[in-house]
Amino acid sequence: PEPPTACREKQYLINSQCCSLCQPGQKLVSDCTEFTETECLPCGESEFLDTWNRETHCHQHKYCDPNLGLRVQQKGTSETDTICTCEEGWHCTSEACESCVLHRSCSPGFGVKQIATGVSDTICEPCPVGFFSNVSSAFEKCHPWTSCETKDLVVQQAGTNKTDVVCGPQDRLRA
């Protein structure tokens, strides 16, 4: 077996030397030599580096712009970026969550299958037979038609996916 010609996992090759990378949260100030160590410095306030690296500059933390409906979900550290999410009633337009849009409402005839979160929109579903929704809502599920029988009433008007059944009294003339 040949000896390693590459550096070890947390090292990089520079000037024929295998130097230690800087650990997360630190940036490279100077490369190692045969007799000096890699010099690293911690990232400043509002900066981060999330990997073992040889970067000479740290990355700026993401800014959660309230004008775009964003707020801080998790504050960044020297090793992690800030995580943004959307204000109540809004959700991210992308995985990176760079802006927000208002949660969609489910139209009459449709109910909420899954309520929206900060990162996903409302999921609507058509109300199946026996269920209805008569409002436009981001929260309401399809409601079951009223059971006239349990109230000792009869159906006077059939329900639809947008309207409930209308119940009425039993026909007294009927035997």
Partner: antibody, heavy 121, light 107 residues
Framework: QVQLVQSGAEVKKPGASVKVSCKAS????????MHWVRQAPGQGLEWMGW????????NFAQQFQGRVTMTRDTSISTAYMEVSRLRSDDTAVFYC??????????????WGQGTLVTVSS | DIQMTQSPSSLSASVGDILTITCRAS??????LNWYQQKPGKAPNLLIS???RLRSGVPSRFSGSGSGTDFTLTISSLQPVDFTTFYC?????????FGQGTKVEIK
């Protein structure tokens, strides 16, 4: 200002275990493999194995497999080497040494001061 | 495993002498060979890496040569501090192995 500082001398009975520590300072501990070398009294140097401080992975010389354990605690930049089921012929000075790789060679550039382990009944 | 055979295992010499220590590998190790000096009660200290690269701070009276299986450490003019033990080491493949050492004594 790289330093490898080892724990103090130990006297152990046959069958016991001993754990030697090696505290690193002056460099990024997880960036360099740490090796252990044994030297019996009046004898030569014997390579025992290495530990990757980042992952904890190890590689041992065959005669040390099974009885020697190498571990590390990255939070305190310390490597450990434990020998179990000690015998009187395990009496030796144990050294930790840092590995340096260049494109022309691989060598130990820094050594601990050594830890004498005496096994005696 | 690669065997490293150092010779002689001990020798007597005088201050000012030229000294040659040899190290033979049981198989080709290219130039993955290091020389260390060890003073009594101390850890070894690297003198030469890659068969011939003198470590900075090591006196120029030390030199190394060789490749493949045969290597030499030469001390051009022995000084009183040189009466210690010298080891060769191969790092071509694990297990890394050392020569048995050469002890240099004052004649």
């Amino acid at each position: 200002q790289v330093q490898l500082v080892q724990s103090g001398a130990e006297v152990k009975k046959p069958g016991a275990s001993v754990k030697v520590s090696c505290k690193a300072s002056g460099y990024t501990f997880a960036g360099y493999y740490m090796h252990w070398v044994r030297q019996a009294p009046g004898q030569g140097l014997e390579w025992m194995g290495w530990i990757n401080p980042d992952s904890g992975g190890t590689n041992f010389a065959q005669q040390f497999q099974g009885r020697v354990t190498m571990t590390r605690d990255t939070s305190i930049s310390t490597a450990y080497m434990e020998v179990s089921r000690l015998r009187s012929d395990d009496t030796a000075v144990f050294y930790c040494a840092r590995e340096k790789i260049t494109m022309t060679g691989i060598y130990f550039d820094y050594w601990g001061q050594g830890t004498l382990v005496t096994v005696s009944s | 495993d690669i065997q490293m055979t150092q010779s002689p295992s001990s020798l007597s010499a005088s201050v000012g002498d030229i000294l040659t220590i040899t190290c033979r590998a049981s198989q080709n190790i290219t130039t993955y060979l290091n020389w260390y000096q060890q003073k009594p009660g101390k850890a070894p200290n690297l003198l030469i890496s890659a068969a011939s690269r003198l470590r900075s701070g090591v006196p120029s009276r030390f030199s190394g040569s060789g490749s493949g299986t045969d290597f030499t450490l030469t001390i051009s003019s022995l000084q009183p501090v040189d009466f210690t033990t010298f080891y060769c080491q191969q790092t071509f493949t694990t297990p890394w192995t050392f020569g048995q050492g050469t002890k240099v004594e004052i004649k």
